[in-house]
């Protein structure tokens, strides 16, 4: 039985040209996290494997950085980066947990988001 829950940064916004950290946290389960996949629609952004470390998809290598922790940092944001992002936690023995984050990239300097998820 899957007892875990994923907490995410929820709906966030950031300025065009800036950076943002996408964070998820799996709690309320003793399941072992074997891998975390970060995705945007049908695109795989990155994989964090518990044994093998990080793989950033080549399409995103120039603007995506691993971490902090199991999170993902998006850099040089454009308005095209607006949309849904998913963290997929592959766990044993529970199976798969999915978290959703909506990112809005704003043209102006009025972007508001939690400071702890922003890269200065």
């Amino acid at each position: 039985m899957m007892t875990g829950t994923i907490e995410t940064t929820g709906n966030i916004s950031a300025e065009k040209g800036g950076s943002i950290i996408l964070q998820c946290h799996l709690s309320s389960t003793t399941a072992q996290v074997t891998q975390v996949n970060w995705e945007q629609q049908d695109q795989l952004l990155a994989i964090c494997n518990a044994d093998l470390g990080w793989h950033i998809s080549p399409s995103f290598k120039d603007r995506v950085a691993p971490g902090p922790g199991l999170g993902l940092t998006l850099q040089s944001l454009t308005v095209n980066d607006t949309g849904e992002y998913f963290c997929i936690y592959h766990t044993y023995p529970d199976g798969t947990y999915t978290g959703r984050i909506f990112l809005e990239v704003l043209e102006s300097s009025v972007a508001e988001h939690g400071a702890r998820f922003q890269i200065p």
Epitope: T34, E39, D42, Q43, I47, D51, L52, H55, P58, S59
Partner: antibody, heavy 120, light 107 residues
Framework: EVQLQESGPGLVKPSETLSLTCAVS????????WNWIRQPPGKKLEYIGY???????YYNPSLKSRVTISRDTSKNQFSLKLSSVTAADTAVYYC??????????????WGQGTTVTVSS | DIVMTQTPLSLSVTPGQPASISCKAS??????VAWYQQKPGQSPQLMIY???YRYTGVPDRFSGSGSGTDFTLKISRVEAEDVGVYYC?????????FGGGTKVEIK
Amino acid sequence: EVQLQESGPGLVKPSETLSLTCAVSGYSITSDSWNWIRQPPGKKLEYIGYISYSGNTYYNPSLKSRVTISRDTSKNQFSLKLSSVTAADTAVYYCARLDFSNYGGAVDYWGQGTTVTVSS
Amino acid sequence: DIVMTQTPLSLSVTPGQPASISCKASQNVRTAVAWYQQKPGQSPQLMIYSASYRYTGVPDRFSGSGSGTDFTLKISRVEAEDVGVYYCQQYYTTPWTFGGGTKVEIK
């Protein structure tokens, strides 16, 4: 250049343990991931498991109860043990390297393969 | 486990003509797909990773495409040296799994 060479008996009796070694040259096994993959005659390639740069192991759940992958860093080699073999374990066994950071789970260097037959 | 299904099983192509191999995943694997070529008597060789990126030294007549569940390996102009078996593989989640292979022959 990375080179991998499998060695071990070509014939194993049913219920015994299959033991293979992969000697690696041109690269240290304390980097990247070191894998075993097999191909039974007329069947798909089957992923057996890996030992990571840090010595952590992953085994395909379908074989997990029978498989052990270990390494000897002083000899720059890693090994496969598969216990309680049956005719279904007859296959070409490949050792291989995987550079997870650059290529994800895509295997970039393979040994030439060694044929193991399980028969009395 | 994710099942990778390749079609066709075999393919006979005239030199200089194109060839196309399909691979279908039993669930969404995004772009975590690789393609390998196995020439007769040799071990598999990585051709494509991340669905569409050519590995070092792979001729540009080879291309990969697709995302989600449907993937394609194309050879724009088949040459005699391209004979062999081609395999797809998913690495979206463990256990990493392979397709059954497509044998490419020359007419």
